[in-house]
Interface confidence: medium
């Protein structure tokens, strides 16, 4: 089970993302924001330091809207 704040790496990170994001899928990197021109990667955010569920969810892909 996923604990509130922990480091997740490798296959464990992928498994957790698949569980959290479900059918939406997920990205390893988010596009750079207007504030920062550098993109952020979930590897760095969750493997190299502790991350929480809210951060994991920001890497889920946005579901396609049905017409």
């Amino acid at each position: 089970a996923y604990r509130p704040s922990e480091t997740l790496c490798g296959g464990e990170l992928v498994d957790t993302l698949q569980f959290v994001c479900g059918d939406r899928g997920f990205y390893f990197s988010r596009p750079a924001s207007r504030v920062s021109r550098r993109s952020r990667g979930i590897v760095e955010e969750c493997c190299f330091r502790s991350c929480d569920l809210a951060l994991l969810e920001t890497y889920c892909a946005t579901p396609a809207k049905s017409e």
């Epitope: 790496c9 490798g10 390893f28 550098r38």
Partner: antibody, heavy 119, light 111 residues
Framework: QVQLQESGPGLVKPSETLSLTCTVS????????WSWIRQPPGKGLEWIGY???????NYNPSLKSRVTISVDTSKNQFSLKLSSVTAADTAVYYC?????????????WGQGTTVTVSS | QSVLTQPPSVSGAPGQRVTISCTGR?????????VHWYQQLPGTAPKLLIY???NRPSGVPDRFSGSKSGTSASLAITGLQAEDEADYYC???????????FGGGTKLTVL
């Protein structure tokens, strides 16, 4: 027990491309992150880049335009290519494993291979 | 110049305690990224000594310990032995550089 072995030419001419391979034995290349690090003679360690077998890569910004790291899961190998080399790229090149167990620390290293850039 | 700053050298007599500092900033150690320490004996590849700020891999003597506070980390070695003579490197991740970073290294001399 996982072991890493770097291989490749020890001498590369200026402006050419340096190509090295790291062979992983005693374990699968899947489910881990893998990294390249180098150490110029008499100097400290410099991170080159790392990747996750699924395709995620991250490179040192100062080398990014010249570096490519690729993986061949069928051979349990990953490779480093560094283009347009100069004498400043002369170094011992190491490959290493990054795991979740060690919170991103590099717990297994190859013995290193010396690459000299000279004409 | 390295993003993580270490003293170039430290020394101590056998049996003594020495510490090696690793000073970062708000984009690396201060941002919560884990710090790792490596020992490099002459002519050999680096070896992971401390991971995740304060954890020892199996086989590393408990004479080695790591700690982290704010934007800095430190490695302490107690009961110094001749075989501890080596180069020591700290490593972390830097969000402003979007990459892993090493300290410049510290040469430990056992007197």
């Amino acid at each position: 027990q996982v072991q890493l072995q770097e291989s490749g030419p020890g001498l590369v001419k200026p402006s050419e491309t340096l190509s090295l391979t790291c062979t992983v034995s005693g374990g699968s290349i899947s489910s881990y992150y893998w990294s390249w690090i180098r150490q110029p003679p008499g100097k400290g360690l410099e991170w080159i880049g790392y990747f996750f077998y699924s395709g995620y890569t991250n490179y040192n910004p100062s080398l990014k335009s010249r570096v490519t790291i690729s993986v061949d899961t069928s051979k349990n190998q990953f490779s480093l290519k560094l283009s347009s080399v100069t004498a400043a790229d002369t170094a011992v090149y190491y490959c290493a494993r990054i795991t979740g167990t060690t919170k991103g620390g590099m717990d297994v290293w190859g013995q290193g291979t010396t690459v000299t850039v000279s004409s | 110049q390295s993003v993580l700053t270490q003293p170039p050298s430290v020394s101590g007599a056998p049996g003594q305690r020495v510490t090696i500092s690793c000073t970062g900033r708000s984009s690396n150690i201060g941002a919560g990224y884990d710090v790792h320490w490596y020992q490099q004996l002459p002519g050999t590849a680096p070896k992971l000594l401390i991971y995740g700020n304060s954890n020892r891999p199996s086989g590393v003597p408990d004479r080695f310990s790591g700690s982290k506070s704010g934007t800095s980390a430190s490695l302490a070695i107690t009961g110094l032995q001749a075989e501890d003579e080596a180069d020591y490197y700290c490593q972390s991740y830097d969000s402003s550089l979007s990459g892993s970073v090493f300290g410049g290294g510290t040469k430990l001399t056992v007197l």
